[in-house]
């Protein structure tokens, strides 16, 4: 059947439609386009002659319509009048007529809308505003916006006049947003630019900020008053109810206890005409003398003295606070405070006992701190430590060595070569040494304070010839797949390169090895059972090398599941039983039995003699390394068959 | 009653120019597309330019580009083109045309002008 569709059915004006047909008979002579659902010669548009291919204009032709030879028809810049039904009459080649209709609908462009306002600044709780999308359009739909969100659900909020118009009842300060009304219709959407609600409300109960109401004096009093309030408040303050100024803030410098009263803060809204006020009441007081700490120990000496620290002056019904870098006092049994809290005594001062302290005393207002008291704790000196820590020399070369002690007062410093005394300073520098410096050299560091002194000697050799290494390790039976081991090569030499070797082999590339410390370290990360090798470190500079004599990794590991053995499972009955079980393990395991869950000998082969059925049943092997705290275990079944029904089993040794 | 008349048409020596005219009857021009087809025997019928006076836009087939110009004064209800540079090969007969704007497709009824470039 031959039809018309109309793409788009709903067209905006100045756009184009096509009448689209469907259907269209074969053999025709031609077709004819009228305006309206009949044929009428005086409303045709348009005739195509199929075989002169010509198209010929009728009387409502507009010159905007175009004719395909598929009889479809365009419509270009579409006016409102264009709207309605559009008939096709198709002439076939037998002169019989047929005929089909179509339709479509024309709607305007609309235009960007504005919003009209009855109510330019409604007052909060009094006023309503009915706001009003322009222009009125036929056929269009209107919507609103808040905050760029649909219309909340609201008895104050009412549309009307077909959504045109929205009206908020008793406005609120809430109600400031930013409004947009919406025009719709089947071609377009519009939207309007946002209008802002200027509600005028307030002024709200003032606060005055900030609360505390006590004050020291001397102090300077700065008041705040604020009131929620549009257009913002203006501010009155009355001080035992005279007024005082036309300000927000009230500062009076320097107050005295004359200063106590009632203070007032009234807030004004010139549109709303409203007035509201907040009092304070404000108290001065006389001021406290600032505290400071006395201590009767000055220099104390750590581990020897206590010291005790008193807030001064000494007031009647004070509170007295105390704080330690800042902080509360923290919880020892090194920190004593007296009944009234006015002396701290540190028992066996330390070094970190240093502080700053401070202590405070609390008024009815605020804590008056003291100023930070900080102790001079005499300790020391430590046991000195001596750098570099190389113990080999090349002759030729410079020794430079540095002594430290971690030391209050700092400590004083002596050497000594081979116990005599050589100079009294830090540093002891002597160039171009020989084998003949080779010794032992001592710093001794002494803290003139408290008279003690501490040395500490290292050897120091001096030789052409490199010594035979060593290698060190921090762990001696690490567990397998859970332990790292670091070996280090010793003595630590200047100028000197290390080498490794594991098996007589130079070490393997391997993501579990890690050279560092100049090579002279080797770490192996999550060792293995297979890391169990000898370990060879080497040193060697531009006149000699060395080699260490191998050190045996001893890894922990296992137990690995056990066997049992021999793996027969059937036997006959009068034969021996004889188990033996065997799991790998460093060290080696203990071994324990049992059959059918029953506990039986701790050894390594279980032996019954002459078995019979009665012995059927499972047979555990458990094993256990108490090294590596690791078990493991092992079931087997065995079954015993009376003399002569086995099929073909000899009997077990 | 809508009608398309064309004129202007005539013998011209190559690289001539020529100024065909298309006075519309019936609607205005404002309002559409107007267009110029041209018929050559042996060769296919081409819309050579168009102009939308409602939407501003023209357009030209590539073999006219940069020497014919249409144009249309709606206070004349007429539409112009400007030949320049003629070739032989533009010889054929001109015929006004009502064009859709997407596609190009054309209606046409006038008599035609007769355009021969020839030395």
């Known amino acids: 059947k031959l039809t018309i569709e109309s793409t788009p059915f709903n067209v905006a004006e100045g756009k184009e439609v096509l009448l689209l047909v469907h259907n269209l008979p074969q053999h025709l002579f031609g077709y004819s386009w009228y305006k309206g659902e009949r044929v009428d010669g005086n409303r045709q548009i348009i005739g195509y002659v199929i075989g002169t291919q010509q198209a010929t204009p009728g009387p409502a032709y507009s010159g905007r319509e175009i004719i395909y030879p598929n009889a479809s028809l365009l419509i270009q810049n579409i006016i409102q009048n264009d709207t309605g039904f559009y008939t096709l009459h198709v002439i076939k080649s037998d002169l019989v007529n047929e005929e089909a209709t179509g339709q479509f609908r024309v709607y305007p462009e609309l235009p960007k809308p504005s919003i009209s306002s009855n109510n330019s600044k409604p007052v909060e709780d009094k006023d309503a505003v009915a706001f009003t999308c322009e222009p009125e359009t036929q056929d269009a739909t209107y919507l609103w916006w808040v905050n760029n969100q649909s219309l909340p659900v609201s008895p104050r909020l009412q549309l009307s006049n077909g959504n045109r118009t929205l009206t908020l009842f008793n406005v609120t300060r809430n109600d400031t947003a930013s409004y947009k009304c919406e025009t719709q219709n089947p071609v377009s959407a519009r939207r309007s630019d946002s209008v802002i609600l200027n509600v005028l409300y307030g002024p709200d109960a003032p606060t005055i900020s900030p609360l505390n109401t006590s004050y020291r004096s001397g102090e300077n009093l700065n008041l705040s008053c604020h009131a929620a309030s549009n257009p913002p408040a203006q501010y009155s303050w009355f001080v035992n109810g005279t007024f005082q100024q036309s300000t927000q803030e009230l500062f009076i410098p320097n107050i005295t206890v004359n200063n106590s009263g009632s203070y007032t803060c009234q807030a004004h809204n010139s549109d709303t005409g409203l007035n509201r006020t907040t009092v304070t009441t404000i108290t001065v007081y006389a001021e406290p003398p600032k505290p400071f700490i006395t201590s009767n120990n000055s220099n104390p000496v750590e581990d020897e003295d206590a010291v005790a620290l008193t807030c001064e002056p000494e007031i009647q019904n004070t509170t007295y606070l105390w704080w330690v870098n800042n902080q509360s006092l923290p919880v020892s049994p090194r920190l004593q405070l007296s009944n009234d809290n006015r002396t701290l005594t540190l028992l066996s001062v330390t070094r970190n006992d240093v502080g700053p302290y401070e202590c405070g005393i609390q008024n009815e207002l605020s804590v008056d701190h003291s100023d930070p008291v900080i102790l001079n704790v005499l300790y020391g000196p430590d046991d000195p430590t001596i750098s570099p820590s190389y113990t080999y020399y090349r002759p030729g070369v410079n020794l430079s060595l540095s002594c430290h002690a971690a030391s209050n007062p700092p400590a004083q410093y002596s050497w000594l070569i081979d116990g005599n005394i050589q100079q009294h300073t830090q540093e002891l520098f002597i160039s171009n040494i020989t084998e003949k410096n080779s010794g032992l050299y001592t710093c001794q560091a002494n803290n003139s304070a408290s008279g003690h002194s501490r040395t500490t000697v290292k050897t120091i050799t001096v030789s052409a010839e490199l010594p035979k290494p060593s290698i060190s390790s921090n762990n001696s039976k690490p567990v397998e797949d859970k332990d790292a081991v670091a070996f280090t090569c010793e003595p630590e030499a200047q100028n000197t390169t290390y080498l490794w070797w594991v098996n007589g082999q130079s070490l393997p590339v391997s993501p579990r090895l890690q050279l560092s410390n100049g090579n002279r370290t080797l770490t192996l990360f999550n060792v293995t059972r297979n890391d169990a090798r000898a370990y060879v470190c080497g040193i060697q500079n531009s006149v000699s090398a060395n080699r260490s004599d191998p050190v045996t990794l001893d890894v922990l590991y296992g137990p690995d599941t056990p066997i049992i053995s021999p793996p027969d499972s059937s036997y006959l009955s009068g034969a021996n039983l004889n188990l033996s079980c065997h799991s790998a393990s460093n060290p080696s395991p203990q071994y324990s039995w049992r059959i059918n869950g029953i506990p039986q000998q701790h050894t390594q082969v279980l032996f019954i003699a002459k078995i019979t059925p009665n012995n059927n049943g499972t047979y555990a092997c458990f094993v256990s390394n108490l090294a590596t705290g690791r078990n493991n275990s092992i079931v087997k079944s065995i079954t015993v068959s009376a003399s002569g029904t086995s099929p073909g089993l000899s009997a077990g040794a | 009653e809508v009608q398309l008349v064309e004129s202007g048409g005539g013998l011209v020596q190559p690289g001539g120019s020529l100024r065909l005219s298309c006075a519309a009857s019936?609607?205005?021009?404002?309002?559409?597309?107007i267009g110029w087809v041209r018929r050559a025997p042996g060769k296919e019928e081409e819309l050579v330019a168009s102009i939308c006076k409602y939407t501003g836009k023209t357009r030209y087939a590539d073999s006219v580009k940069g020497r014919f110009t249409i144009s249309a004064d709606t206070s004349k209800n007429t539409a112009y083109l400007q030949m320049n540079s003629l070739r032989a090969e533009d010889t054929a007969v001109y015929y006004c045309?009502?064009?859709?704007?997407?596609?190009?497709?054309?209606?046409?009824w006038g008599q035609g002008t007769t355009v021969t470039v020839s030395s």
């Open positions: 045309a009502i064009v859709a704007s997407g596609d190009g497709w054309y209606n046409y």
């Open positions: 019936g609607f205005n021009i404002k309002d559409t597309c």
